[in-house]
């Protein structure tokens, strides 16, 4: 995990001093290469990156999308509303990440380097948003009866759900990574 | 066209004040983090500061902190520079800056203000 | 800080030869820019992220390097290339900038 900490971030009058904005970006990247070594896996395991079917297995999910109300793009952009989405959205992402956890064979480190990082990644955004309106937490028993839910799947749709979050995540922490270096 | 213009350099005394103001046209200013960047005469750029889009967050050099204040007007799409307790050193063209958007380049300049700081 | 240090200082070439400018980093950087300026005018970004060709600019520029070394090639130099370049970093803040290389006619 990336460490750091930059002292020359200083808060605007109404802030607190910031985590490193450095520590941040590496912090993504570092995950991103992550997935991107998970993804070869998948894909060189099943040929579910190239499968049309993903909307059967899209039902089931409910994944962390960046939308245009999100304040994240650079129409529409706005700071902290898109920070209080992407640590809303990388909570969310978590339980996703938890089920990633068994899936993988030769990348089993991969998987939890990709997890542990995340949680760390959370920690910095959250002390940078430290004056921002309360995150909502996602419900830890709506949680555990989704990774129920999602581990009774057939090996096809767990294939294909595995896919999919790795896709999601990636999408989600490129649009992240892309408004946060506005921050 | 896009553009930036800075306005407010000139002549002050050391331990005086000055407020610079950079007045950007052409593009929708509210996605845009800025930055002030410096140039003493016949010298290199040395960066000064930057504020995000929304004016949250602002980051500065250890030479201006404490001393220099970068603030925005969004309905303006103006970025300022409120600099006290100038000091010789400071005397330099102070360009803004705009940083392009997903990235950490900065990508369009103004043509820059000078300011001289002698007594 | 991160230092960063190009060479050489200055440079005498002729139109349609090949140059080469190197900057070298204290430490390992997340990210390098170059950029043009020209004197009595602001500095114009040539190249971000080491290697991306920013808009406008022509593709006689190119940017290389990782790590702490760092390269900017003009692969045929043009008249309206004489001018001094700097490389940037960014690595958290403060952004810092190379001394300058000046590249004048032979």
């Known amino acids: 995990v990336p460490p750091g900490e930059d002292s020359k971030d200083v808060a605007a009058p109404h802030r607190q001093p910031l985590t490193s904005s450095e520590r941040i970006d590496k912090q993504i990247r570092y995950i991103l290469d992550g997935i991107s070594a998970l993804r070869k896996e998948t894909c060189n395991k099943s040929n579910m990156c190239e499968s049309s079917k993903e909307a059967l297995a899209e039902n089931n999910l409910n994944l962390p999308k960046m939308a245009e109300k999100d304040g994240c793009f650079q129409s529409g952009f706005n700071e902290e509303t898109c920070l209080v989405k992407i640590i809303t959205g990388l909570l969310e992402f978590e339980v996703y990440l938890e089920y990633l956890q068994n899936r993988f064979e030769s990348s089993e480190e991969q998987a939890r380097a990709v997890q542990m990082s995340t949680k760390v990644l959370i920690q910095f955004l959250q002390k940078k948003a430290k004056n921002l309106d309360a995150i909502t937490t996602p419900d830890p028993t709506t949680n555990a009866s989704l990774l129920t839910k999602l581990q009774a799947q057939n090996q096809w749709l767990q294939d294909m759900t595995t896919h999919l979050i790795l896709r999601s995540f990636k999408e989600f922490l490129q649009s992240s990574l892309r408004a946060l270096r506005q921050m | 066209e896009v553009q930036l213009v800075e306005s407010g350099g000139g002549l002050v005394q050391p331990g005086g004040s000055l407020r610079l103001s950079c007045a950007a046209s052409g593009f929708t200013f509210s996605p845009f983090a800025m930055s002030w960047v410096r140039q003493a005469p016949g010298k290199g750029l040395e960066w000064v500061a930057k504020i995000s889009p929304g004016g949250s967050w602002t980051y500065y050099s250890d030479t201006v902190t404490g001393r220099f204040t970068f603030s925005l007007d969004t309905s303006k799409s103006t970025a300022y520079l409120q600099m006290n307790s100038l000091r010789a050193e400071d005397t330099a063209v102070y360009y803004c800056?705009?940083?392009?958007?997903?990235?950490?380049?900065?990508?369009?300049w103004g043509q820059g203000t000078l300011v001289t700081v002698s007594s | 800080d991160i230092q960063l240090t190009q060479s050489p200082s200055s440079l005498s070439a002729s139109v349609g030869d090949r140059v080469t400018i190197t900057c070298s980093a204290s430490?390992?950087?997340?990210?390098m820019f170059w950029y043009q300026q020209k004197p009595g005018k602001a500095p114009k970004l040539l190249i971000y992220d080491m290697s991306n060709l920013a808009s406008g600019v022509p593709s006689r520029f190119s940017g290389s390097g990782s790590g702490t070394d760092f390269t900017l090639t003009i692969s045929s130099l043009q008249p309206e290339d004489f001018a001094t370049y700097y490389c940037m970093q960014w690595s958290g803040y403060p952004y810092t900038f190379g001394q300058g290389t000046k590249v004048e006619i032979k």
């Open positions: 800056a705009r940083q392009l958007w997903g990235y950490y380049a900065l990508d369009i």
């Open positions: 430490i390992s950087v997340s990210y």
